[in-house]
């Protein structure tokens, strides 16, 4: 049909933190290269129907469905989704093609389905069909990598049984401590599965796919380091592989390394040794202890000994099931408005946890730091001095853990007032929770010193959103005070705040803040 326009359908994926994705469904900003969706004419359909290739979208992803129409003259359009019509504003690009867009922000289940676009041009009418579904990430997995010895070679293979297939990389560092942080210049990354250079100080393997990134460190005892006060501890689940590396450097080759489990030499086939000369001609030896699939009886003290270095041990504990050990009792904190303060949770867990900090239904990233004693710690400092309930949640494959914190900010009360025909109420969220006084202002008491005690009702309520307490005081109106100014004052150890209310007949009530 010569009259049919040339149509192009494209999908634009937006990065999730992309501020360029606007609310408008007509002029989205392109943030990724568009993907052609084909848009073929659908055979045997009544009318002219184009069908775009099916679109699979991750949950929470933001996308734009876009149609480019090469047809003379003006066009008008209408989007229909689940029997609802949606506004459609075509515009023209630099090549004078009609452009129609539908922006879907933060994809959810309810936004999945068929999107129909009806276009009317001067020459003809036609329909374009988009089918949008959520990618089934339930089948996705991301498993922590583990190590295997490469057959007949002194090399380690890093394996992560994940779906989709992950990208595997080795993360190597040759300096000590803090300088081995991920983005440090001392860190070298190698995007490959096999590693031959096994003499480095710190060796990790990481696997990443759509679900994120998981890493496993090669557990190492360095005999040139002074023995730690706390014996290093390694947890494994039954069936997992055990790998421990013992490393030692000496001025010459005249030393050997041995592994023992509970004072018995490891069986042949459960260890292998490598050695090399370093740049300053000292000899580096490493001895790996490994068990391809651990059982309960592999638990115990693994000791690496050398004829030229102090021996060192690690306690290997084999568990049936993962765990998270921490105290889950809730904790309350009271701090000043400008005091520096962080929440912290100390825990021991295996496998490593995934965690979040939550405040007021908003989640914050959670960082964990390993301590020398086998525990880890997570701190949260980004509370911006907002009082309320903070929640730490952690989970791994086998366990879940939640801990509640309450943050109270010491501050002088701030009073808000409201009134009706029958009563006046004052509210304050100062901390410590304030006490209340009501005073009547009259000719006899122009400074409002005449205290009102009758008809006053105080209460504290939990403001659910932030989990913070709000104190209120209500004065029931009596004939004795109608038409007078009254003053409610909230006071605590940090100060007093008052509000003056005119108790007149029903109608708007003026409030005068008086601090």
């Amino acid at each position: 049909n010569q009259d049919l326009p040339v149509i192009k359908c494209v999908l634009i994926n937006h990065k999730n933190n992309d501020s360029s994705v606007g609310k408008s469904s007509s002029y989205p900003m392109v943030s990724e290269s568009p993907e052609d969706l084909g848009c073929a004419l659908r055979p045997q359909s009544s009318g002219t129907v184009y069908e775009a290739a099916a679109v699979e979208v991750d949950v929470s992803a933001s996308i734009t469905l876009q149609v480019l129409v090469d047809a003379p003259g003006n066009i008008s359009c209408l989007w229909v989704f689940k029997h609802s019509s949606l506004n459609c504003q075509p515009h023209f690009d630099l090549q004078n093609r009609g452009v129609v867009s539908m922006v879907i922000l933060k994809m959810t289940e309810t936004q999945a389905g068929e999107y129909l676009l009806f276009i009317q041009s001067e020459a003809t009418n036609y329909t374009i069909l988009f089918t949008v579904s959520i990618r089934n990430t339930l089948l996705y997995t991301l498993r922590r990598p583990y190590f295997r010895k490469m057959e007949n070679q002194d090399a380690l293979v890093c394996i992560s049984e994940s779906v989709p297939e992950p990208i595997v990389e080795w993360v190597l560092c040759d300096s000590q401590g803090e300088s081995c942080k991920e983005e440090s210049p001392a860190v070298v990354k190698k995007e490959e599965k096999v590693l031959h250079e096994l003499f480095g100080t710190d060796i990790r393997c990481c696997a990443r796919n759509e679900l994120g990134r998981e890493c496993t460190r090669l557990f190492t005892i360095d005999l040139n380091q002074t023995p730690q006060t706390t014996l290093p501890q390694l947890f494994l689940k039954v069936g997992e592989p055990l790998w421990i590396r013992c490393k030692a450097v000496h001025v010459n080759h005249g030393f050997g390394l041995t592994w023992e489990l509970e004072n018995k030499a490891l069986e042949e086939g459960n260890y292998f040794e490598m050695s090399t000369y370093s740049t300053n001609r000292t000899m580096i030896r490493i001895l790996f202890a490994f068990v391809s699939s651990v059982a309960r009886n592999d638990t115990g003290y693994y000791t690496c000994s050398s004829s030229k270095h102090p021996s060192q041990s690690a306690l290997v504990t084999i568990v049936e099931k993962g765990f998270i050990n921490a105290t889950n009792s809730s904790e309350d904190y009271e701090i000043d408005q400008y005091e520096e303060f962080c929440f912290s949770v100390r825990f021991k867990a295996y496998p490593q946890i995934r965690c979040t900090w939550t405040f007021s239904r908003k989640s914050f990233p959670c960082e964990q730091k390993g301590l020398d004693n086998g525990y880890s710690i997570s701190k949260f400092c980004n509370h911006k001095h907002q009082p309320g309930e903070y929640i730490f949640h952690a989970e791994n494959d086998d366990a879940q853990f939640t801990k509640m914190f309450t943050l109270n900010i010491r501050r002088k009360p701030q009073v808000l007032a409201e009134a009706s025909a029958s009563q006046a109420s004052c509210f304050s969220d100062g901390y410590p929770l304030p006490s209340w006084t009501w005073k009547k202002c009259s000719d006899k008491s122009p400074n409002c010193t005449e205290e009102i005690t009758e008809g006053v009702w105080n209460r504290k309520a939990n403001r659910k959103v932030f989990g913070q307490w709000v104190s209120s005081s209500t004065l029931n109106m009596s004939e004795a005070i109608k038409g007078f100014l009254v003053k409610c004052c909230a006071y605590n150890s940090l100060g007093t705040s008052c509000e003056t209310i005119l108790l007149n007949s029903p109608g708007p009530f003026p409030f005068i803040q008086d601090n």
Epitope: N263, Y301, S307, P310, S311
Partner: nanobody
């Protein structure tokens, strides 16, 4: 139940000697290496010396040439002979086998 008991600490003058003992029970003593550590007030616990089960000895740089570690497997005891003591050797001295620690013995060196 592994138990370690240190003894032999006390108050001495700088330049004097002391001999600490660590008696062990509940552990295959002859099959274990033993470490001595010390902790001065306000400081971290620091490693001092080790004797391996084969009798090899190792020392922290700060005590090399002055301290000597030895063991008597028949008595399940390890000794730390401390000579030419200095005020900076003042600390509580602990012995350790694997994750097991003794209660410690106080050594005070006055100048």
């Amino acid at each position: 139940q592994v138990q370690l008991q240190e003894s032999g600490g006390g108050l001495v003058q700088a330049g004097d000697s002391l001999r600490l003992s660590c008696a062990a029970s509940g552990v295959t003593f002859s099959a274990s290496y033993i470490d001595w550590y010390r902790q001065a007030p306000g400081n971290e616990r620091e490693w001092v010396a080790q004797i391996t089960r084969g009798g090899d000895s190792f020392y922290a740089d700060s005590v090399k040439g002055r301290f000597a570690i030895s063991r008597d497997n028949a008595k399940n005891t390890v000794y730390l002979q401390m000579n030419s003591l200095k005020p900076e050797d003042t600390a509580v001295y602990y012995c350790r086998v694997l994750s097991y620690w003794g209660q410690g013995t106080q050594v005070t060196v006055s100048s």
